[in-house]
């Protein structure tokens, strides 16, 4: 650090004083010197280092008429809002000719109530779930001892006897407030009060109970919710975008979910108005007066196939000699699954009904054995999926080939060429 030489007497006639105070204090350090000739610029040092950005003012008063007479120079360093970083040894420094002079030191000290570097923050936690809160304070004067309070009740017999910087809370069953007191020789400072809101735990065991083509019944086990009863649970369902949508653990749905509310108990809900034979993802969250739990993971589920909702359309049945030609079109009504084929039934008067599986073809030729004389022959057709047969069409009549003669009908399916 620069030092004044001993060859000449120091120009300083007034040295910086001492300041000791609490954080935020405003104070001024002052030094005065008397010099002959042009007044020098006064610099301030803190702990031996020049302060480049000091908030200082310099006043110069001539003691005579001539420039070469003596001058009184006063420099004032203003400290606004005293902080720990302001503390230390302060000196004034001047360069006079080839010599450097420094004043006697003054000291700035911080001593007051503890100051919080970290305070507990508001947060939400699931009921009966461990969490940590943080609090950190400093002096001077040191030491600073902390005392945690829960709902204004101290958690230790005296400051410094309980947890200090970090408070581990093994779990809460009701919304609570936490604060921390910092104690030192000057007194006590109290932190902000953090509100810890207790939400229900995430539900567990979300699973499928039963399923129909257009509805799914799901159930779950509620998590603990502390002293606050669950008011309802919310279930969300989204279409699974052909495997491109939600994967395990993905947080947000790719589209607007279908949302249903379930009053509780029971912890079960029937989701209706779904598409048959369609994959969905579902998740659930439960709510108390304090707010909602976190969502469960997305659970992949699927509605089963249903039977076709209507019969095949535009059935026509015509006869040519011993052959009957029947054709139809796919049902207009929803199939509710993958069409596997058609069943055809035909019956003549006084003859047993014959049931045939046609497969996915939409026409068939029936070979009427013998002389083909069957009266009042009627045909009906139904579509089917893996879930079973849809409704049968109304019977479509064929004109009698030879009225009055009834012979057994022996069917042969002729493959269309």
């Amino acid at each position: 650090a620069p030092r004044g030489t001993q060859a000449e007497e120091s120009p300083f006639v007034g040295n910086p004083g001492n300041i000791t105070g609490a954080r935020g204090l405003t104070g001024t350090l002052r030094c005065q010197l008397q010099v002959q000739g042009e007044p020098p610029e006064v610099h301030w040092l803190r702990d031996g280092q020049i302060l480049e950005l000091a908030d200082s003012t310099q006043t110069q008063v001539p003691l005579g008429e001539d420039e070469q007479d003596d001058w009184i120079v006063v420099s004032q360093l203003r400290i606004t809002s005293l902080q720990l970083s302001d503390t230390g040894q302060y000196q004034c420094l001047v360069f006079l000719g080839h010599q450097t002079f420094v004043s006697q030191p003054g000291y700035v000290g911080l001593e007051g109530l503890p100051y919080f570097l970290e305070e507990p923050e508001d947060r939400t936690v699931a009921a009966n779930t461990p969490f940590n809160l943080s609090c950190q304070a400093q002096g001077p004067p040191e030491p600073v001892d902390l005392l945690w309070l829960q709902d204004a009740v101290p958690l230790a017999t005296a400051p410094g006897h309980g947890p200090q910087r970090s408070l581990h809370v093994p779990g809460l069953n009701k919304t609570s407030s936490f604060s921390c007191e910092a104690h030192n020789a000057k007194g006590v400072t109290t932190s902000r009060t953090a509100t810890i809101t207790v939400l229900p735990q995430q539900p567990r065991n979300l699973h499928l109970v039963s399923r129909q083509p257009t509805e799914l019944e799901v159930a779950w086990t509620p998590g603990l919710s502390g002293i606050y009863p669950l008011t309802h649970c919310t279930l969300q369902a989204v279409l699974s975008d052909d495997g491109m949508g939600i994967q395990a653990g993905e947080p947000d749905p790719p589209e607007e979910p279908l949302t249903s509310q379930a009053s509780v108990p029971p912890h079960q809900l029937r989701l209706g108005s779904l598409h048959p034979h369609t994959p969905y993802h579902i998740r659930v969250a439960c709510t108390s007066s304090q707010g909602p739990s976190s969502w469960t993971h997305w659970l992949p589920v699927e509605t089963p196939e249903g039977v076709p909702l209507g019969p095949p359309e535009n059935i026509s049945a015509t006869r040519n000699g011993s052959q009957a030609f029947v054709h139809w079109q796919e049902p207009r009504a929803p199939l509710q699954g993958t069409l596997l084929g058609y069943r055809l039934a035909y019956q003549g008067q006084d003859t047993p009904e014959v049931l045939m599986d046609i497969g996915l073809r939409q026409e068939v030729t029936l070979e009427l054995q013998g002389d083909g004389s069957v009266s009042n022959l009627t045909v009906c057709v139904a579509a089917y999926t893996a879930a079973g047969d849809g409704p049968w069409s109304l019977p479509v009549p064929l004109e009698a080939w030879r009225p009055g003669q009834a012979q057994p009908v022996h069917q042969l399916v002729k493959e269309p060429s």
Partner: antibody, heavy 119, light 112 residues
Framework: QVQLKQSGPGLVKPSQSLSLTCSVT?????????WNWIRQFPGNKLEWMGY???????NYNPSLKNRISITRDTSKNQFFLKLNSVTTEDTATYYC????????????WGQGTSVTVSS | ELVMTQSPFSNAVTLGTSASISCRSS???????????LYWYLQKPGQSPQLLIY???NLASGVPDRFSSSGSGTDFTLRISRVEAEDVGVYYC?????????FGAGTKLELK
């Protein structure tokens, strides 16, 4: 609260049929879930035997397919296991259990019935 | 059918310490939907099996969070962070990806 309670004889002669009953309270067996039978051999090995679904369909372990039948009586909320032509190899503790749909996770189990096959 | 292999056959641990049980499947249990269809059961002495973990890592209701499970498609580990006296019994892994459902041979956890 769902409970499964088992009953049935503890001793069966070889070549005869083993029949056990699982009585369910707290949930209707025709309203949902798969209703399973599992057995545990001496030495602790577990074997899934099959289930009766809430909709009346069945699924059996191929290793037992020709001998096993799982039926139910919805009016009594009971389901049953019948295992034909038993041998000493069928000596085990038999459990009934409720299984979730689609992926069969079994969350409620009966208390178990120890069955010995011996003449 | 899918074969489940567990190790070790038995595991003796001290109260308060951690324990690990391994399970391997003969094929991947990872479904195209992103979930892994492995579960763990605990059978306490004289009791029926009880569900601990489903879909590889989800704790069943009422299961303390000192239990955890992780793994790949074929190799899985059940961990108990601080063993308590009530944790003794036989632990089974099982697969529910497909029928027939199959189980591991079990790992017996006992106290030293």
């Amino acid at each position: 609260q769902v409970q499964l309670k088992q009953s049935g004889p503890g001793l069966v002669k070889p070549s005869q049929s083993l029949s056990l009953t699982c009585s369910v309270t707290g949930f209707s067996i025709s309203s949902g879930y798969y209703w399973n039978w599992i057995r545990q051999f001496p030495g602790n090995k577990l074997e899934w035997m099959g289930y009766r679904s809430y909709d009346g369909s069945n699924n059996y372990n191929p290793s037992l397919k020709n001998r096993i039948s799982i039926t139910r009586d919805t009016s009594k909320n009971q389901f049953f296991l019948k295992l034909n032509s038993v041998t000493t190899e069928d000596t085990a503790t038999y459990y009934c259990a409720r299984g979730w749909l689609l992926h069969y996770t079994m969350d409620y189990w009966g208390q178990g019935t120890s069955v010995t096959v011996s003449s | 059918e899918l074969v489940m292999t567990q190790s070790p056959f038995s595991n003796a641990v001290t109260l308060g310490t951690s324990a690990s049980i391994s399970c391997r499947s003969s094929r991947s249990l990872l479904h195209s939907n992103g979930f892994t269809y492995l579960y763990w059961y605990l059978q306490k002495p004289g009791q029926s099996p009880q569900l601990l973990i489903y879909q590889m890592s989800n704790l069943a209701s009422g299961v303390p969070d000192r239990f955890s499970s992780s793994g790949s498609g074929t190799d899985f580990t059940l961990r108990i962070s601080r063993v308590e006296a009530e944790d003794v019994g036989v632990y089974y892994c099982g697969q529910n990806l497909e029928l027939p459902l199959t189980f591991g041979a079990g790992t017996k956890l006992e106290l030293k």
